[in-house]
């Protein structure tokens, strides 16, 4: 398994991840956002709500 060198993002990238943690993937020369639960998107900019549908009558 190839090891990936990671560190925190620089101050230059403050605010890059809207709802998540910014990680600097050194070997890939990329900033990466690790999103909080409920958020998605490159910069954790999209909120998604998982709606659990109640069981329909035929399953009751």
């Amino acid at each position: 398994v190839a090891q990936v060198s990671i560190t925190k993002c620089s101050s230059d990238m403050n605010g890059y991840c809207l709802h998540g943690q910014c990680i600097y993937l050194v070997d890939m020369s990329q900033n990466y956002c690790r999103c909080e639960v409920g958020y998605t998107g490159v910069r954790c900019e999209h909120f998604f709500l998982t709606v659990h549908q109640p069981l329909s009558k035929e399953y009751v």
Epitope: T7, S10, G15, V42, R43
Partner: antibody, heavy 116, light 106 residues
Framework: QDQLVQSGAEVKKPGASVKVSCKAS????????IQWVRQAPGQGLEWMGR????????KYREKFEGRVTITADTSTNTAYMELSSLRSEDTAVYYC?????????WGQGTLVTVSS | DIQMTQSPSSLSASVGDRVTITCKAS??????IAWYQQKPGQAPRLLIQ???TLQPGVPSRFSGSGSGTDYTFTISSLQPEDIATYYC????????FGGGTKVEIK
């Protein structure tokens, strides 16, 4: 593949304004920051400022504050840099640079000549 | 603003020589420094980022080191195609370029 295509060369008179465009293809500018860098003939590289196209936030180098305006139109995936009150020392190649999802990725540059 | 002092501003060396360029930051930049090569009429080319990480396709004769405020860029064996101007860039807090080093062949 990913590209930043800048507008063509401009010749302006002292005191005028110039607006340089930077159109992205192959990626969404909302996923990045767009930086602007300039280089006067025979001189070094100078960072001017940047925009966060997703939120519209801008940061400028102090010496350009009040004279430069960086904007972005996410519907056309294009960033802009407008410099006003031009003087001869503003003659330079202006570059847009993507950062964020890729460390640095440069446009081809736009030559702006300020001459009376 | 963070200032980046790059030295020397120019140097002349023979093919095969070891070439060293330094950049000193006005404050700790936490290893967030990149090195660029620029040839006349071309956009800068990224060689190294995060102090020492070589970009894909960049020859191993190029290297970088340092920490805190002091950083070094080295060409272990100068080649004719290395004739260019080299710039450091800090990206810890916004961005600042060093003044550049013009490398020529003796």
């Amino acid at each position: 593949q990913d590209q930043l295509v800048q507008s063509g060369a401009e010749v302006k008179k002292p005191g005028a304004s110039v607006k340089v465009s930077c159109k992205a293809s192959g990626f969404n500018i909302k996923d990045t920051y767009i930086q602007w860098v300039r280089q006067a003939p025979g001189q070094g590289l100078e960072w001017m400022g940047r925009i966060d196209p997703l939120r519209g936030n801008t940061k400028y180098r102090e010496k350009f504050e009040g004279r430069v305006t960086i904007t972005a139109d996410t519907s056309t995936n294009t960033a802009y840099m407008e410099l006003s009150s031009l003087r001869s020392e503003d003659t330079a190649v202006y570059y847009c640079v993507r950062s964020g999802t890729l460390f640095d990725f440069w446009g081809q540059g736009t030559l702006v000549t300020v001459s009376s | 603003d963070i200032q980046m002092t790059q030295s020397p501003s120019s140097l002349s060396a023979s093919v095969g020589d070891r070439v060293t360029i330094t950049c000193k930051a006005s404050q700790d930049i936490h290893k967030y420094i990149a090195w660029y090569q620029q040839k006349p009429g071309q956009a800068p080319r990224l060689l190294i980022q995060y102090t020492s990480t070589l970009q894909p396709g960049v020859p191993s004769r190029f290297s970088g080191s340092g920490s805190g405020t002091d950083y070094t860029f080295t060409i272990s064996s100068l080649q004719p195609e290395d004739i260019a101007t080299y710039y450091c860039l800090q990206y810890d807090n916004l961005r600042t370029f060093g003044g550049g080093t013009k490398v020529e062949i003796k």
